[in-house]
Interface confidence: low
């Protein structure tokens, strides 16, 4: 059997392609015959299903070649708060020992992350015999779970959460250190494994693995909002908002922005992924009486989707009967 | 229980088409390569084809090369052999055959032999 | 023709001991595992010997393989009525890049 491909390396140049390049292996023990090229959609960090990224406005950033996430909070929070209930200039709010705690754990999070994504190395499968006739399992990251009291995060199953393994596909790669592999998921990562194969492959089975992580690129109008944007009138001064969310977005959406107002001035409502897998839309609650549009914005791991075209809807006023039994 | 089950077969005039499909249950059918297998009437077993794990690698016997395809479709668990260009030598009862565990890697390895079969299907080509 | 070579016909008393041969070549047998199957009338074939000796479980061991050079044998000792069959023997053939099979030995029980 050849010993491990060497310098395995890979770049994305589109939202659904990586390119993927190695050096031969510096023991071919015989002919080097074939390379096997195997790949596998890891799935997110189960944080990021959790974390409520309407709560204090962070906002997922790229920032590391390995395809890791970074959160950042937005330094600028446009839902400003008043200090002590007084007009005047705003200023931030001093931060609760909770605030500071999440923070100081996030922070933990981050660098445990960064670190286990950097030093992750393949621990090969228990040693079995080749007489054992049993299923082979697939090798994988397992997803982290992360223990936290904090405000900011859901306590709720994500469907997609519960994917934690995904196939590994697989293809065959003769004479030649490099390859290119389509048909992936946009802004998305992935490991892939390859595999140096000898004249004795047949016999023997090939190398273990040499691999890399590597993210697709975003593509460009996957976080748009697919369809229409709809409503249906509510009681108490509120209307209902429904939208389909889009269907192969970078990587996963993270929150909703929706825009609305009459003529006088914009409000602005998140929505967080949670709450939009628990009711498929949101409700907009204490609307004076008058004609409103609204717009609406997915927010993906790797940024915003375009806004939808505005919807119309209206808010009836209520009857001097209804007022008087209100 | 591991199932193999095997459809599609029929007659078929000379030159014409046909696509065999092989139904998978009972066990985790992404991890293992798949093979088929005819038999043609009274006559011996002959391997026409093998498709690794994922997909991505495929052989095939040089009487059929050219001619036929395998292919898998991992989420609907199923196998295919498509059948172009059909001589009266193909007639025969076609085995989609499971390949017994495979090294980490998911090469062509026969080591295991193919360990669960399925009960065939009949392909007559004649005129 | 077949690439590996089966006596056509093989046949014993319930009790006997009986062996069936399988001949092949460097490409074959000399470098690769030999599987054996065996066809009941009217059935599909079932995997006797895997890894030129092993059974899978469930094959009782009265069914015993082992490979030598280039030939490969399977052994049925305690012959039953039920062994009646056809049997097949299997390597990968590395310079054909295919898999193939002995011509089947018809297994009669006397």
């Known amino acids: 059997v050849p010993s491990i491909p060497l310098d395995v390396l890979s770049a994305s140049n589109s939202s659904s392609q990586l390119i993927v390049k190695w050096n031969p292996p510096s023991l071919p023990n015989g002919n080097l015959s074939y390379y096997i090229v195997r790949w596998q959609r890891q799935p997110q960090d189960g944080y990021l299903y959790r974390h409520n990224y309407c709560s204090k406005d962070k906002i997922p950033i790229r920032k590391y070649a390995d395809g890791t996430i970074d959160i950042e909070e937005v330094t600028e929070n446009p839902k400003t708060e008043v200090c002590g209930g007084e007009k005047g200039p705003c200023c931030a709010c001093p931060k609760t020992e909770a605030e500071k705690q999440a923070e100081k754990e996030e922070a933990e999070y981050r660098k445990v992350f960064e670190n286990f994504l950097h030093n992750s190395i393949f621990v090969p499968r228990p040693e079995r015999k080749r007489r054992d006739v049993m299923q082979v399992a697939n090798t994988t990251m397992s997803s982290r779970s992360r223990n936290t009291t904090a405000a900011d995060t859901y306590n709720i199953t994500d469907p997609e959460e519960l994917e934690t393994e995904y196939p590994f596909f697989e293809s065959r790669v003769d004479n030649k250190e490099r390859t290119v592999i389509s048909n992936l998921r946009p802004f998305t990562l992935y490991r892939i494994d390859i595999h140096s194969c000898n004249h004795e492959a047949e016999k023997l089975g090939c190398s273990a693995s040499n691999f890399v992580f590597a993210r697709t690129m975003p593509a460009e109008g996957a976080d748009d909002i697919p369809g229409p944007v709809t409503w249906e009138p509510r009681p108490e001064n509120s209307i209902f908002l429904k939208w389909p969310e889009p269907e192969n977005p970078n990587g996963l959406i993270l929150m909703y922005e929706i825009k609305y107002g009459s003529q006088v001035e914009d409000q602005r409502e998140c929505v967080s992924r949670q709450e939009y897998r628990k009711y498929g839309g949101a409700k907009l609650n204490r609307l004076n009486p008058g004609n409103y549009t609204a717009r609406i914005q997915a927010t993906s791991l790797s940024g915003n989707g375009s806004w939808t075209d505005p919807v119309f809807f209206y808010v009836q006023a209520k009857t001097g009967y209804e007022n008087f039994i209100h | 229980e591991v199932q193999l089950l095997e459809s599609g077969g029929g007659l078929v005039q000379p030159g014409g088409s046909l696509r065999l499909s092989c139904a998978a249950s009972g066990f985790t059918f992404s991890n293992y390569a798949m093979s088929w297998v005819r038999q043609a009437p009274g006559k011996g077993l002959e391997w026409v084809s093998w498709?690794?794990?994922?997909?991505?690698?495929?052989y095939y016997a040089d009487s059929v090369k050219g001619r036929f395809t395998i292919s898998r479709d991992n989420s609907k668990n199923t196998l295919y052999l498509q059948m172009n260009s059909l001589r009266a030598e193909d007639t025969a009862v076609y085995y989609c055959a499971k390949l017994g565990s495979l090294f980490p890697n998911a090469t062509a390895s026969y080591a295991y032999g193919m360990d669960v079969w399925g009960q065939g299907t009949l392909v007559t080509v004649s005129s | 023709q077949s690439v590996l070579t089966q006596p056509p016909s093989a046949s014993g008393t319930p009790g006997q001991r009986v062996t069936i041969s399988c001949s092949g070549s460097s490409s074959n047998i000399g470098s690769n595992d030999v599987s054996w199957y065996q066809q009941l009338p009217g059935t599909a074939p079932k995997l006797l010997i895997y890894d030129n000796s092993q059974r899978p479980s469930g094959v009782p061991d009265r069914f015993s393989g082992s490979k030598s050079g280039t030939s490969a044998s399977l052994a049925i000792s305690g012959l039953r009525s039920e062994d009646e069959a056809d049997y097949y023997c299997?390597?990968?053939?590395?310079?054909?890049?295919?898999?193939?099979f002995g011509g089947g030995t018809k297994l009669t029980v006397l």
């Open positions: 299997g390597s990968w053939d590395a310079s054909l890049n295919a898999y193939v």
């Open positions: 498709i690794s794990s994922g997909g991505g690698s495929t």
